[in-house]
């Protein structure tokens, strides 16, 4: 059972009049513009900035008063500012959505340290993992390392978006006062949706006597 609660002063259940609501989309997948209405009799128009209107055809684009506009396989045409409009009692209401295309491509993953890493016991280990992706891509970066169960490492993350062609994600792993138990394989794993890449390096610990 779906119940409409009619409100003449608020035709849309969620109103984003000033700041658009961000909707993440993937080309070829279903995209819902969730401008559901407070009454099934409200006529809604879906506009694409700057000068177009999407026409529901009952196939690729469907209007459902309980959900909004359902686009069965989104294309590049739906990227940008989309506005749902409804006129109630002579008053025009608008709710705005900004579609953001997400890609899942990981171009490259590197650990910017010589391999294998040779370190004196008691010194600090710093490993910098760098993931390069196209714009509009987000990634999750995780580390696995020998003494992970004791949470020996601290990890800092940052994004460099100054490049006009790519995003560069950094994950910096730091372990203070390295001990023998910290030696072994260090792996940086990068995931974006279904895409996955990893890179690893071996860390060797030496006493001063053996240098």
């Amino acid at each position: 059972i779906y119940i409409f609660i009619s409100d003449t002063g608020r035709p849309f259940v969620e109103m984003y009049s000033e700041i658009p609501e961000i909707i993440h989309m993937t080309e070829g997948r279903e995209l819902v513009i969730p401008c559901r209405v407070t009454s099934p009799n409200i006529t809604v128009t879906l506009k694409k900035f700057p000068l177009d209107t999407l026409i529901p055809d009952g196939k690729r684009i469907i209007w459902d008063s309980r959900k909004g506009f359902i686009i069965s396989n989104a294309t590049y045409k739906e990227i940008g500012l989309l506005t749902c409009e409804a006129t109630v009692n002579g008053h025009l209401y608008k709710t705005n959505y900004l579609t953001h295309r997400q890609t899942n491509t990981i171009i490259d993953v590197q650990i910017s340290t010589p391999r294998p890493v040779k370190l004196l016991r008691g010194h600090t280990l710093v490993l910098n993992c760098t993931a390069t992706t196209p714009l509009n891509t987000r990634v999750q970066m995780t580390w696995s390392y020998p003494d992970e169960k004791n949470k020996r490492a601290s990890v800092r993350r940052r994004i460099d978006q100054s490049n006009s062609h790519a995003n560069i994600f950094y994950s910096v792993l730091t372990i203070d006062k390295m001990q023998n138990k910290d030696k072994g394989l260090y792996t940086c794993r990068v995931r974006s949706g279904p895409s996955f890449k990893s890179v690893n390096t071996s860390v060797h610990i030496y006493d001063k006597a053996f240098i």
Epitope: N41, T43, K48, L51, D52, T53, I55, P56, G58
Partner: antibody
Framework: EVQLVESGGDLVKPGGSLKLSCAAS????????MSWVRQTPDKRLEWVAT????????YYSDSVEGRFTISRDNANNTLFLQMSSLKSEDTAMFYC??????????????WGQGTSVTVSS | DIQMTQSPSSLSASLGGKVTITCKTS??????IAWYQHKPGKGPRLLIH???TLQPGIPSRFSGSGSGRDYSFSISNLEPEDIATYYC????????FGGGTKLEIK
Amino acid sequence: EVQLVESGGDLVKPGGSLKLSCAASGFTFSDSGMSWVRQTPDKRLEWVATISSGGGYTYYSDSVEGRFTISRDNANNTLFLQMSSLKSEDTAMFYCARLGNYGGYYGMDYWGQGTSVTVSS
Amino acid sequence: DIQMTQSPSSLSASLGGKVTITCKTSQDSNKYIAWYQHKPGKGPRLLIHYTSTLQPGIPSRFSGSGSGRDYSFSISNLEPEDIATYYCLQYDNLWTFGGGTKLEIK
């Protein structure tokens, strides 16, 4: 007053091409989706093609897909239908119609008087 | 695509009388049904949209009803200017017209 005036209809041989035009006035053309609908000699109405207000979205019936192209010139308030590889079964009166939003979906609300297309050798 | 079966294909009625035309769709059209009047030499004229809503300026002698797959259109108190062919249209899934009903006055 909404006015739609079609032109360009003619007698054409099978396999030939023809371009229809529809001059619009009395409303904000650039805000309106538009369609072409034809009436066959047996008086049946058949939807042919539709274009969104900005021209970014086009829709075609299976019978004309790949042969006909709908387009528009918003600066000059004109709708077009480029027809190629014409067949005898394309013989019809072609109407242009404005779309109106009725409950979230679009129906044709205003129509022109039509232009006649005959495909015959 | 949705198919539309309109009946009857023609009918004759007396002035002042009432006629009813029906349209059956091959699948639920969610009330997205319109009715048109078409006279020779002119373009079709929209009378009713969304099953039962009269267009501005259309007399209340015209009416529509229905839901799901079954829809009907009626003209009461028939007048001479009602002589025309009437068409239904479903606009829920692309656009499909009924075959038309030619109305004559006895």
